[in-house]
């Protein structure tokens, strides 16, 4: 920690400006006052500190807000965020995604941190589930976030949500939570009609039940092979030829290549060969 | 071994019909569509149509519809194409090939002429 | 219908070179390609299915990539037995079109 000292004549800071980065550490300390930087934070991330500098700073920060900043200085830390603990984070109350928005932008580009998932898990635990305009903020930054999550964390977002999710970002996501996704993305699709609803709901479809897919082979969708192969097994199972037939369209052609590939495999041991002759693809059960 | 085995050559005069056959052996014949293709002398390769031996299921090209009928034999399994009203641009080496594209015939060639 | 648009309609190349041939599609046929190579007098012979798979007996110095409309066939270090016509054709519903061909000769 720097020693207490007093700050020497004429060099106490009016302002926060670039004649800091010419401050030793031990006259930051003494020199630049805790609550005008607070108020000046804004002003930090145009100025080229040192990391020692800026650790400092963050010292000055603690000691004036010892229980969490308040938002008006989390909103503008910048480059200090990365400077920032989970334990320091823990004690923030961040309710604003303009906030949350600065804060990500810092750490774009980078894998998801310590720091950020803190961040991230005390903006939506106050906010009290993953609404639309946050699931979209997180997305654009990390794709893979809604993946990351546990069933159990899914199961707070609400339908409402399911909006904004892109197909990329469903692109890790097990089984367990397309199982938890699946039924919120039914709901919120409900009301398109037959082609629009299969384009939105195809990238949850790996946590459809066989009925739904039955269904869905009565509306001309034509599911590519990809789609195809991350549905649930048990789910695929139970379908006739003709009804995947019917869910593929022109692409039953790929069935061929994937023959030895689950679900495709257990499904074509499933059916009578008279059934998988019907396809003409020369598939053997 | 596997094989699709056509006639080498059929002559046939302006107008006639001719029926051309190809006959599969060594592979569930019932288990793959058969295609028929279509390649004139010195040309590309045109597809015609595609007959499923178990649905009886056929897909034509609109050009050749009007002429050409794909019938299957599953007792001997062998494919057919039948030709009618010829004229001297249906000449041309025909193929009959399985589904999948590993299997081709060798071709017969039709000539008509008078 | 999907219309399939092969090229170079010829190219002349030299033993040991390599050479691209490129098919595109009218539309979107997923990865639903094939490719064939024939010789003067002779059926056509499978190389490629699949867009990029090998068919059996195939030699490695053939390789198909691309995927929706746009596709290609590059042949690596030809030897003289390369030589011939080869021919791309969509495999995703009917009709089965192929394209025009491209005509490979020795330099």
């Known amino acids: 920690e720097v020693e207490k000292t007093a700050c020497p004549s004429g060099k106490k800071a009016p302002e926060i400006d670039e004649s800091l980065i010419f401050y030793k550490k031990w006259e930051l300390e003494a020199c630049v006052d805790a609550a005008l930087l607070a108020t000046q934070m804004d002003r930090v991330n145009a100025i080229p500190f040192t990391y020692e500098q800026l650790d400092v700073l963050k010292h000055k920060l603690d000691e004036l807000y010892p229980q969490g900043y308040p938002e008006s200085v989390i909103q503008h830390l910048g480059y200090l965020f990365l400077k920032m603990s989970p334990e320091d984070i823990r004690k923030w109350n961040v309710t604003s995604l303009e906030t949350l928005k600065a804060l990500l932008e810092v750490n774009k580009g980078h894998e998801m941190s310590p720091q950020v998932a803190t961040l991230i898990d005390r903006f939506v635990k106050g906010r009290g589930q993953l609404d639309k305009d946050t699931l979209d903020t997180l997305t654009a930054f990390y794709p893979g976030y809604l993946c990351s999550l546990s069933p159990e964390e899914l199961s707070s977002v609400p339908p409402s949500s399911i909006w904004a999710v892109r197909p990329q970002d469903l692109d890790t996501c097990d089984p367990r939570q397309l199982d938890v996704l699946y039924p919120k993305a039914r709901l919120a699709f409900q009301n398109m009609n037959g082609s629009e609803y299969f384009v939105k709901i195809q990238s949850f479809l790996g946590g459809a039940p066989t009925e739904d897919l039955k269904a869905l082979s009565q509306q001309n969708v034509s599911m590519d092979l990809a789609t195809f192969m991350k549905l649930r097994t048990d789910a695929v199972l139970p379908l006739t030829v003709a009804e995947v037939q019917k869910l593929l369209g022109p692409h039953v052609e790929g069935l061929k290549a994937e023959e030895r590939h689950r679900p495709v495999r257990d499904w074509i041991l499933r059916q009578r060969q008279d059934d998988l002759d019907t396809l003409g693809l020369g598939l053997q059960g | 071994q596997v094989q699709l085995q056509q006639p080498g050559t059929e002559l046939v005069k302006p107008g006639a019909s001719v029926r051309l056959s190809c006959r599969a052996s060594?592979?569930?014949?019932?288990?793959?569509?058969m295609h028929w293709v279509k390649q004139r002398p010195g040309q590309g390769l045109e597809w015609l149509g595609n007959?499923?031996?178990?649905?009886?299921?056929?897909n034509y090209n609109e050009k050749f519809r009007n002429r050409a009928t794909l019938a299957v034999d599953k007792s001997s399994t062998t494919a057919y194409l039948q030709l009618t009203s010829l004229t001297s641009e249906d000449s041309a080496v025909y193929f009959c090939v399985r589904h999948d594209g590993f299997l081709w015939g060798q071709g017969t060639t039709l000539t008509v002429s008078s | 219908d999907i219309q399939m648009t092969q090229s170079p309609a010829s190219l002349s190349a030299s033993v040991g070179e390599t050479v691209t041939i490129t098919c595109r599609a009218s539309e979107n046929i997923y990865s639903y390609l094939a490719w064939y190579q024939q010789k003067q007098g002779k059926s056509p012979q499978l190389l490629v299915y699949y867009a990029k798979t090998l068919a059996e007996g195939v030699s490695s110095r053939f390789s198909g990539s691309g995927s929706g409309t746009q596709f290609s066939l590059k042949i690596n270090s030809l030897q003289p037995e390369d030589f011939g016509t080869y021919y791309c054709q969509h495999q995703f519903g009917t009709p089965r079109t192929f394209g025009g061909g491209t005509k490979l000769e020795i330099r």
């Open positions: 060594g592979y569930s014949f019932s288990s793959y569509w």
């Open positions: 007959i499923n031996p178990t649905t009886g299921d056929i």
